[in-house]
Amino acid sequence: KSPVFGPQEVSSVEGNSVSIKCYYPPTSVNRHTRKYWCRKGASGRCITLVSSEGYVSSNYAGRANLTNFPENGTFVVNIAQLSRDDSGHYKCGLGINSRGLSFDVSLEVSQGPELPNGTEVYTVDVGRTVTIKCPFKTENAPKTKALYKKIGQTSVLVIDSRNYVNPNYKDRIRLRIPGTGQLIFTVVIDRLRLSDHGLYLCQAGDGSNRDEKNADLQVLEPEPELVYEDLRGSVTFHCALGLEVANVAKFLCRVNSRETCDVVINTLGKRDSAFEGRILLNPQDKDGSFSVVITGLRKEDEGRYLCGAHSDGQLQEGWPIQAWQLFVNEESTIPRSPTVVKGVAGGSVAVLCPYNPKESQSLKYWCLWEGAQNGRCPLLVESQGLVQEQYEGRLSLLQEPGNGTFTVILNQLTTQDAGFYWCLTNGDTRWRTTVEIKIIEGEPNLKVPGNVTAVLGETLNIPCHFPCKFSSYEKYWCKWSNTGCQTLPSQDEGPSEAFVNCDENSRLVSLTLNPVTRADEGWYWCGVKQGHFYGETAAVYVAVEEKKVAGSRYVSPAKADAAPDEKVLDSGVREIENKAIQDPRLFAEEKVVADTGDQAGGSRASVDSSSSEEQGGSSK
């Protein structure tokens, strides 16, 4: 007996898709061996149609695939655009077709039911509306019009022109008789249920002269669209339910083991706490369609999702729905990165954001998730250098370390900065990730003056104190602008004896501006890093004023003033929308911080440090 298991019989109709799931013992060998789907021929040989090694036969090209889920011990064969020629005997298996472990599957593709001559077929999704057209002759114009449902050998009256309505159709059916001259009446049934499925008979008049017309109503359950996404990645559910429900509350729910559907998010403001910080319901288009984005996918997010419309914002029978079956692949291409980053008030964080390494030229963004109503994510910074005004001087997006990761640095942290942030690009939308910033108790490791006033033409020296744990880190000063933070030339003095022993007086890296010019005004960052990986930063604002007194100025932390006033957030905040993800230029207009002018450089700015050793770890 083979340990491989699957459906023994699969039946469907022409044009449909099937998704055949085969189970195998998830031993190490089985997980990594070849998986296949083959068709048994008259000779007994089994001809491969699709395999896990990428082979797809010409008969299956463009309509079939095989996906292995090694962590579950399953693989799934999807076959679309079925025809009656696909009917036959197949095997799903592991290893070699002729002697591997396998399971026999019978696939039967039928044409659909035989119907009486002249039957009109109406194929409609559950929850939608159907209009059945019923023609009649002139002599039956004044006579009773009716719609019957055929159940077995009997006919049950559904509605007639004498105002009878079958209780099963109450409040969702109407019979329309047009004005004179039009020899057709219509029956409109709203909010179709699966139980409405079947053969109907239109009738006008009675006796041998009556007009009859058969109608076959096929009410379809939504075929769940199979969605395969990577662990830690992102999924977008696009939901188009039709104009009939354009103004009705929308929802996305997940079907649970009790066969009810738990609301994940709806337009009435409800949201499942398990999706806090990682879900957005994008606004509806005029046609009532909307989309839901979920980032930071977890294994437990797997399952059947339904989107729908109902005034209660939750699933109700007879209202339109769309369905998806989400699978989360644990063998993810998306690298692990911290989902929580901690910082202290006044300190900083450096967040690593993954992106698809094949899209190194894509624009990178960072946005702040806001949970109000359906959720929104105003952009704070992007790789082209635009930064929200309130983040001026304390936020920067760096392309480093590159090769699938960029860095976002946020400093001068306050408790208001706690929350969820999204990393995204204008490329592969599946690589959106979420990180939560938490503000914890503690003191910043790097100490700089709060505010510095420099005098034109003089020398300015700004100290940055760091603790012993950063002794082996690379230290730097940079001048912040809305396009990044330009590193200033370093004048390291080399390791002194005092520094090697981490002497109190040696834990200092200083920035010298000589002579001070107008262009030197702005934000400066002192930071530590290790290669291309950034650690903590501290920011100081340098204001430049006219000469009042002679001599150079040394500013110590004791003389630090308050930081300059924060600018107010502009109202035209950019948000993630369907269109915007594809084309960031489609975001709403936004005020940007003007470039702060020439970078400090040349021999005028120098960084003094008692160390030139490389950085040795993360400051987080």
């Epitope: 298991f5 459906p7 023994q8 019989e9 699969v10 039946s11 469907s12 109709v13 449909n16 898709s17 099937v18 998704s19 055949i20 189970y23 579950n72 559950v126 249920r193 699966l194 379809l220 359950e221 939504p222 075929e223 769940p224 079907v255 649970n256 083991s257 009790r258 066969e259 009810t260 559907c261 399952g303 059947r304 339904l306 699933l315 029978e317 079956q325």
Partner: nanobody, 126 residues
């Protein structure tokens, strides 16, 4: 909630046939999986057959001991699933339970099913 009511059990001779029915009522519009498990006296409950569906596509799963003898089917309009049992053997004697769920990862695992009927007794005498 979903209610499941089994019927059709009884006493038959070895080699005879029997047809079990399971009618589902209540909130069945998200039900996509229905099946049968059985429990012989003094034994664990075991998988017999399951039918899962999606639109007009059906998938039928059977346990090895019943393959080729038992057939599972459903009537969508009546929210009913059937188990046609042919060539019955004494070892088929058990209480047969109908079960349903929205989605199951593995149809053979009984803990993946949300709802269970009270069971109907099938006795096959030799």
């Amino acid at each position: 909630e979903v209610q499941l009511v089994e019927s059709g059990g009884g006493l038959v001779q070895a080699g005879d046939s029997l047809r079990l029915s399971c009618a589902a009522s209540g909130r069945t519009f998200t039900t996509y999986v229905m099946g049968w498990f059985r429990q012989a006296p003094g034994k664990d409950r075991e998988f017999v057959a399951t039918i899962t569906w999606s639109g007009s596509t059906n998938y039928k799963y059977y346990a090895d001991p019943v393959k080729g003898r038992f057939t599972i089917s459903r009537d969508n309009a009546k929210n009913t699933v059937y188990l046609q049992m042919n060539s019955l053997k004494p070892e088929d004697t058990a209480v047969y339970y109908c079960t349903s769920s929205t989605v199951v990862t593995d149809p053979r695992k009984l803990n993946e099913y949300a709802y269970w009927g009270q069971g109907t007794l099938v006795t096959v005498s030799s």
